[in-house]
Amino acid sequence: MDSFNYTTPDYGHYDDKDTLDLNTPVDKTSNTLRVPDILALVIFAVVFLVGVLGNALVVWVTAFEAKRTINAIWFLNLAVADFLSCLALPILFTSIVQHHHWPFGGAACSILPSLILLNMYASILLLATISADRFLLVFKPIWCQNFRGAGLAWIACAVAWGLALLLTIPSFLYRVVREEYFPPKVLCGVDYSHDKRRERAVAIVRLVLGFLWPLLTLTICYTFILLRTWSRRATRSTKTLKVVVAVVASFFIFWLPYQVTGIMMSFLEPSSPTFLLLKKLDSLCVSFAYINCCINPIIYVVAGQGFQGRLRKSLPSLLRNVLTEESVVRESKSFTRSTVDTMAQKTQAV
């Protein structure tokens, strides 16, 4: 059931209410959108513009550097994940404008809304990989000197993407199109029907693997890194560390509403008032999570301006400066036992 022969009939949506104004002829359309939906549309529009342009620029800047700079590999992969998700936004935008009517067919319903979850898993797994890289640079500089290379970075990214795809499968499989009889519209959503336990399991896995576990591990990781950095009074610029911390923090901030409402809805009775209220906020929560897809380029620009004092350089060169800074260990051509202490001190800053 890939596409419906659906034509919008000569009567409308009645805004999801089980009420019908009988003074109004049945065949008239109600065009009012809810406030959360309007806010979601505004966010989607901004995210699309900033996300597509910003991430395209980041991809362009980092792609050339990815062969020789490991940081560029990390930021390139993050930008690709964000850019991919932004491509679904015009479709999601159109659907909300049409009162959540989905005229794009079953295949699009399975793929497009799943992109944000793919982005979530890909982003958090990439951020975990980046964080592990920062951690090793601080605590295992010798190991980094010997083994930290572009090849290993690309393998780590490939693993992150593979796992992200794997974790997105449940959402993908349970997405269906449902054509409601009245008010007449096709809806795209998840349907677990008989399996409430499976719905809860998917929500719990999403919360734990996509939010709580990363939050815990990354908090511990950066606590150690920052403590070591401050205790050693690092001399090098902490620009990459600051950028990564900002990216990680924004991830958790913008995914929080989606995760909270998602877990609540999986435990609530679908006909309960709380469930229905949360469902009305669903688009807004998704749009809020989508801010992740455009926030990184903003962070990079803000960071670049901060490091430059003011925006003197062109945007690409500013981004290049932020995203392609190589870590200290790679800059040292010769490495001897006598330099270990100095190395350990220098790498605190990355």
Epitope: D16, K17, D18, L20, L22, V26, F182, P183, F275
Partner: antibody, heavy 125, light 112 residues
């Protein structure tokens, strides 16, 4: 009182067409949607589609979309269903059923409150 | 299409007995507005179907209070507290949440 009077039994050959009628009385014809339902002998009910007599808008079950045509004549308060390219599988009782747009605390055309007596269609060579 | 599965197919009862008919849908019948559009019809021998219960639990006008409906999502039940002779016939559940509208295969309530 509300009445839906359906036309008499029909006998038709395979490949032919028939037009069944359903005359409404006792209420305002254009204020209610008219649905058509099929029931094969000893079997369940199957929804064919509906017509909004006020606007002429129709919606069909995909299974019947190519062969069923629903129409309504406001002046005579009569709904019609034409079935074309008949096969033996079309032998059944066909009901017209009225759908109220509001009832009690329920608003929306969700259930059939009155049914016609049914028209028996027999397809035989 | 939403498949409506009714159990049992046949229900032999004695007059005055309690009767319970189950209806299960292949997809959730919760509409985007939160309602379940699940209805029950009775078809007496040689007659057209007649509406008993609409929207899960609301009795249609003239329907005795011995008939009651319950359920949500995918599982629904029709209960008859004290079966009377006029209750005999075939009971159909029907959903009007999704297109196409579909009916259960029917449960025949008959005397033991």
């Amino acid at each position: 009182q509300v009445q839906l009077q359906q036309s008499g039994a029909e006998l038709a050959k395979p490949g032919a067409s028939v037009k069944l009628s359903c005359k409404a009385s006792g209420y305002t014809f254009t204020s209610y949607w008219m649905h058509w339902v099929k029931q094969r002998p000893g079997q369940g009910l199957e929804w064919i589609g509906y017509i909004n007599p006020s606007s002429g808008y129709t919606k069909y079950n995909q299974k019947f979309k190519d062969r069923a045509t629903l129409t309504a004549d406001k002046s005579s308060s009569t709904a019609y269903m034409q079935l074309s390219s008949l096969t033996y599988e079309d032998s059944a009782v066909y009901y017209c059923a009225r759908v109220p747009l509001s009832y009690g605390s329920s608003y929306g055309p969700y259930f059939f409150d009155y049914w016609g007596q049914g028209t028996t269609l027999t397809v035989s060579s | 299409d939403v498949v409506m599965t009714q159990t049992p197919l046949s229900l032999p009862v004695s007059l005055g007995d309690h009767a319970s008919i189950s209806c299960r849908s292949s997809q959730s019948l919760i509409h985007s507005n939160g309602n379940n559009y699940l209805h029950w019809y009775l078809q007496k021998p040689g007659q057209s179907p007649q509406l008993l219960i609409y929207k899960v639990s609301n009795r249609f006008s003239g329907v005795p209070d011995r008939f009651s409906g319950s359920g949500s999502g995918t599982d629904f039940t029709l209960k008859i507290s004290r079966v009377e002779a006029e209750d005999l016939g075939v009971y159909f559940c029907s959903q009007s949440t999704l297109v196409p509208l579909t009916f259960g295969s029917g449960t025949k309530l008959e005397l033991r």
